[in-house]
Interface confidence: low
């Protein structure tokens, strides 16, 4: 067992080294480890094959370090890994697209608060078991087409607190099991009418605190399971172009936030849902 760590076998074979001031992944981690806790240290680099010997590893926590670089082959051989937490490593900024390849059993991936500026093509390829993906509080500006395409079992996708300016047509392709999509506190000004086409099981959609002045109801039509919708804190324009959204909100049987109008001035601060149809005039 590495000097700064505690190793024990029950209830699972565990190597636990949190908050020890470690500057590198320690050598001598027992190969039988099922859980490795390295959070809260000063680790800046995860070299290739750092955990290759740990074939039984299911949980790996590397959050709250100072990671600036993760080699593409850092997690090679971890076929049984279920939970990987890399969050709160603000210097990371980018992740090689091959980093997570081969992690076919991964069900939870934390990449929040990592200073990520983009999601490279194929970053999440092959993660068929993934259920929870935490990408909030980064610096993401765009959602590339088909980024999440292989994530057919994903139920929770957290993208809030980024700089995303639009939701393109293919951003969420393949997310047939998605239950919660959190997109609040971004800069979203435009949602493609077909952006949510695959989200038939979505129950919670947060779009509050963005830059939306309009939202095509065609985008909302596929959301048959939707129960919770938050649209507040957006610059909604409540003129005739808002009539389809107004009509959709009248029929919506779930729970929705207020939709306060910004324009025209005479309706500023009023809730779109509570307006009469003939209030929505002029284009």
């Amino acid at each position: 067992c590495p000097g700064a760590c505690v190793c024990y076998n029950e209830p699972k074979v565990t190597t636990s080294c949190p908050q020890q001031g470690l500057q590198a992944v320690p050598v001598g981690i027992p190969a039988a480890s099922q859980r490795i806790f390295l959070h809260g240290n000063r680790i800046s680099h995860v070299p290739a094959a750092s955990f290759r010997a740990c074939r039984n590893l299911t949980i790996l926590w590397l959050h709250s370090n100072v990671l600036a670089r993760i080699d593409a082959a850092a997690f090679t051989g971890l076929a049984l890994l279920e939970q990987l937490d890399l969050s709160d490593n603000a210097q990371l900024r980018s992740v090689d697209p091959a980093t997570f390849h081969g992690l076919g059993r991964l069900h939870t991936l934390h990449l929040d608060r990592c200073g990520l500026q983009e999601l490279g093509p194929g970053l999440f390829r092959g993660l068929a078991a993934l259920q929870y993906l935490y990408l909030q509080d980064n610096a993401l500006q765009a959602l590339p087409d088909d980024t999440f395409r292989d994530l057919g079992n994903l139920t929770h996708l957290f993208l809030h607190g980024n700089r995303i300016s639009s939701v393109p047509e293919r951003a969420f392709r393949g997310l047939h099991s998605l239950d919660r999509l959190l997109l609040h506190q971004n800069r979203v000004a435009h949602v493609h009418p077909h952006a949510f086409r695959d989200l038939g099981r979505l129950m919670t959609l947060y779009l509050f605190a963005n830059n939306l002045s309009a939202l095509p109801t065609e985008a909302l039509a596929p959301l048959r399971a939707l129960q919770y919708l938050r649209l507040n804190d957006n610059p909604w324009v409540c003129d005739c172009r808002a009539r389809p959204l107004w009509a959709w909100l009248q029929k919506f049987r779930g729970s929705s936030s207020e939709v306060p109008c910004s324009l025209p001035q005479r309706l500023a601060g009023r809730d779109l849902k509570r307006l009469a149809a003939n209030d929505l005039q002029g284009c």
């Epitope: 209830p11 939970q83 969050s87 929040d112 509080d137």
Partner: antibody, heavy 126, light 110 residues
Framework: EVQLLESGGGLVQPGGSLRLSCAAS????????MSWVRQAPGKGLEWVSA????????YYADSVKGRFTISRDNSKNTLYLQMNSLRAEDTAVYYC???????????????????WGRGTMVTVSS | QPVLTQPPSASGTPGQRVTISCSGS????????VNWYQQLPGTAPKLLLY???QRPSGVPDRFSGSKSGTSASLAISGLQSEDEADYYC???????????FGTGTKVTVL
Amino acid sequence: EVQLLESGGGLVQPGGSLRLSCAASGFTFSSYAMSWVRQAPGKGLEWVSAISGSGGSTYYADSVKGRFTISRDNSKNTLYLQMNSLRAEDTAVYYCARAPHYDLWSKYYFRGMDVWGRGTMVTVSS
Amino acid sequence: QPVLTQPPSASGTPGQRVTISCSGSSSNIGRNTVNWYQQLPGTAPKLLLYNNDQRPSGVPDRFSGSKSGTSASLAISGLQSEDEADYYCSARDDSLNGYVFGTGTKVTVL
């Protein structure tokens, strides 16, 4: 030293309002979610509300939903709990606590509340 | 109301092993990890264990935890007089979209 210090408690009549504050020091306040937990005299702990580090996500126990509002001012390192329409059953010591996690959606683990204040007493009585 | 059930009291003599159970459901303990808190008389609660069995720095190794299905337990081996306190289990609850505490167990050192 990491510290949390609650204030704002006192005696208030049923139906009244009170605003609790929690001043944080010794850590990067905006990086942590925060919670309010209360304890009625002689009773157990009850989670009241939580807020994410940015303040963008808030959560409430059913018993206070619609009456209490949690907020934070990261520039002042301060957490707040605005309590309206107070009832006798809200009488308790109110603790603020640091939660080193992302938000309460985190399904597979929640690392607990690792720093607590000493609490402030709220009494609702006529 | 607490949705995690604990025995109201437990006791032992110094040096003995005491175990406290915590029973929940599929929406809390069944799907989420368990934390334990210790509250010494007249003080604020203190985090004792997180992630079912992890000890924060400074917590003695005589405290251990485990989880199985919808139940969890806290064991204190080598009971000491300073362990006399109230102990609470807790977990996230998916159906309530919040955090729940157990009913609490008062540990008395005889």
